[in-house]
Structure formats: C-alpha cells, structure tokens
Amino acid sequence: YDFTNCDFEKIKAAYLSTISKDLITYMSGTKSTEFNNTVSCSNRPHCLTEIQSLTFNPTAGCASLAKEMFAMKTKAALAIWCPGYSETQINATQAMKKRRKRKVTTNKCLEQVSQLQGLWRRFNRPLLKQQ
C-alpha cells in the first residue's frame, strides 16, 4: 500500500490520543533504555510503511501483535484516514488469521514494540533531519 495520500495529521492525532497510550501500557515495566532503536524511517509515508510491517507482519520470536489494542487502533486509523487501505489489506489480513499464534508477550515482542514507539515518534516529527 502506498501511504502517500493518507491524512497524516489525523493519524498523528489518533496516535497521540490513543495509540501512544496503548504502546506505553504494553511496554509497562520495561525500562526505556532497554532496547536500542535499529529501525528508522525517512518521511511520513515511509514511517507508516515500517509501522505497518512491524505491527502486522509476524517476525521470528514475535508471532503476532495484531490482536493488541495498539495494533487494532493502528489498523482502524489507517483504514479511516488512508484512502483505499481497507481494500488493499483485506486479503493480507485473512492470510494472517490463518497462521495466527496464541498471544504471548515475549522479550522479542517488547523489543519490536519499542521499535514501533521510535517509528511513531519519528512519524510525528517529519521535519527533523535523519540522524
């Protein structure tokens, strides 16, 4: 999906009002310095591409974050404010459902969500130069 035509300000507002709080809740009990940010993004469409990938694609050691509150709100915000997003994602979502594992919070998942927090922070500051 090409995130170029999304309403970035509406998505930012959704992040600030709800998604950020859910990410913090998921990470509660974890020190903010525990994980190094290794994933970055260069502009808002790129940030959303990375956020979608880390949130919804299973990775080694973290089978699925898709049922977490922050993930469901991310999906809804993208579906509302990114034209055509629902249509392009519906088949991918159904494929994901077939291979979903049970919900377990592993250290790998915590690391992945820490990366997500960094990507969202970067999304909210689009004018900052890349480090």
């Epitope: 600030l16 709800t18 859910d22 509150m69 469901m72 709100k73 809804a76 579906a79 509302i80 519906i90």
Partner: antibody
Framework: QVQLVQSGAEVKKPGASVKVSCKAS????????MHWVRQAPGQGLEWMGW????????NHARKFQGRVTMTRDTSISTAYMELSRLRSDDTAVYYC??????????????WGQGTLVTVSS | QSVLTQPPSVSGAPGQRVTISCTGS?????????VHWYQLLPGTAPKLLIF???NRPSGVPDRFSGSKSGTSASLAITGLQAEDEADYYC?????????????FGGGTKLTVL
C-alpha cells in the same frame, strides 16, 4: 450557528444514480471533514465515507467501493454525495455530518436534516 | 445487522431512570475505542448527546450520562421527560477491515409512558 442544509427527497429507478447536496454555513467549510451516513427504513445508521473539503480527498467504506463519489464546491460551501447503480436496498435517508473529532477519530457534532432517497421501479 | 447491539426499545415513566446498553466485541469497544451517543428526535436533525464515553457537549442536560466497561457501553437518562422520547444510537470504531470502520448500533426507541 452551524447549519447543514440538504437537498430534497428523490425517487429513482434501479440502476440510476442520485446526487445529494449539503450546504454548510456558520463555520469555515474547508476546516472540517464532511462525512456521509445513511439510515435504511427500520435499520441502524451506516457510515459511508468522508470528504476533506480543503483538498477534495475522499475515502469510503468498502461496501460502497466503485459506487460512491464525494465531491465539493468550496465557492458555495457545498458537499455532494453521488451514489450510482442504485438498488432497492439503497432506499434510505442520507445525512451529511460534520466531523469535529480532534482526537483523530471521527466525531459527528452537526448533522444535516437528511435526504430521503427512494429506489423503486 | 449492526456491529454494535442495542435493545430495540426501552420505556419509562416521567421522572424515572432508564439505561440503554450498547454491546460490542473485542475488535471495537473491547479494543478500547471510544463510544459516542446520538439522539434522533422525530422530524429533526440527529444530535450528538455524549462523546468519548462520558462527556456531554455544551447544551446537553446533565440528566444524560454515559459509561463504558469491557465490550459494552451504556447511556443513562435520569429524570425522564416527555421530550426525551426519541431514537438513540451508539457509535464506535472497528478494526475488522471486512466491514465498516466507523460503526453504529441498531438504535433504541425510547418511549416515555
């Protein structure tokens, strides 16, 4: 005060198209998204989609893909919703609604009076 | 079939308290999405009654209140008055991409006896 005034009732044949207008006043038209919601007889409310009056950008519920077109004319502060290939189950009251959600989630604080569209052969 | 489930009708005598429930699932209300309530009076434009679960817009009497817990929400009306007779709808959001993202209940008709 904020007002959304919609066009009058329409009767259409199956397969035809209908275009409903919504004239906004009492606020800056280009400052807030306009959504469309409908209510079929005896049914609940159903979200159709939105238009950004500033940019003209739109999005719609999957159900209406390829059938709904949302446009606007900023010079007269009016939003339009056109639904094509009408079927009998499109018979409904269609509402334009202003979105004042500042939290990134749609919140409908002002509604038009509704436009009844009847689809009948 | 609405995503959010409301009782088709409720009734009460003037001065009484009535509640209207709105039941969802883990993909909408249970996921922590806010719930809003709208009042549809016969012959008038619908009106926002409660937003963000329990907040009233200015001009809405404090007889109306909202709450949310788990996968459901409710609207309470105390000191029922004849002019409260209307249809009431809850609204939230849903992460199930195969349906609508902005979702409503089927509506509840309130009759003041």
């Amino acid at each position: 005060q904020v007002q959304l005034v919609q066009s009058g009732a329409e009767v259409k044949k199956p397969g035809a198209s209908v275009k409903v207008s919504c004239k906004a006043s009492g606020y800056i038209f280009t400052g807030d998204y306009m959504h469309w919601v409908r209510q079929a007889p005896g049914q609940g409310l159903e979200w159709m989609g939105w238009i950004n009056p500033n940019s003209g950008g739109t999005n719609h519920a999957r159900k209406f893909q390829g059938r709904v077109t949302m446009t606007r004319d900023t010079s007269i502060s009016t939003a339009y919703m056109e639904l094509s290939r009408l079927r009998s189950d499109d018979t409904a009251v269609y509402y334009c609604v202003r979105d004042r959600g500042t939290s990134g989630w749609p919140l409908f604080d002002y509604w038009g009076q509704g436009t009844l569209v009847t689809v009948s052969s | 079939q609405s995503v959010l489930t409301q009782p088709p009708s409720v009734s009460g005598a003037p001065g009484q308290r009535v509640t209207i429930s709105c039941t969802g699932s883990s993909s909408n209300i249970g996921a922590g999405f806010d719930v809003h309530w709208y009042q549809l009076l016969p012959g008038t434009a619908p009106k926002l009654l409660i937003f963000d679960n329990n907040n009233r817009p200015s001009g809405v009497p404090d007889r109306f209140s909202g709450s949310k817990s788990g996968t459901s929400a409710s609207l309470a009306i105390t000191g029922l008055q004849a002019e409260d007779e209307a249809d009431y709808y809850c609204q939230s959001y849903d992460s199930n991409l195969s349906g609508s993202i902005v979702v409503f209940g089927g509506g509840t008709k309130l009759t003041v006896l």
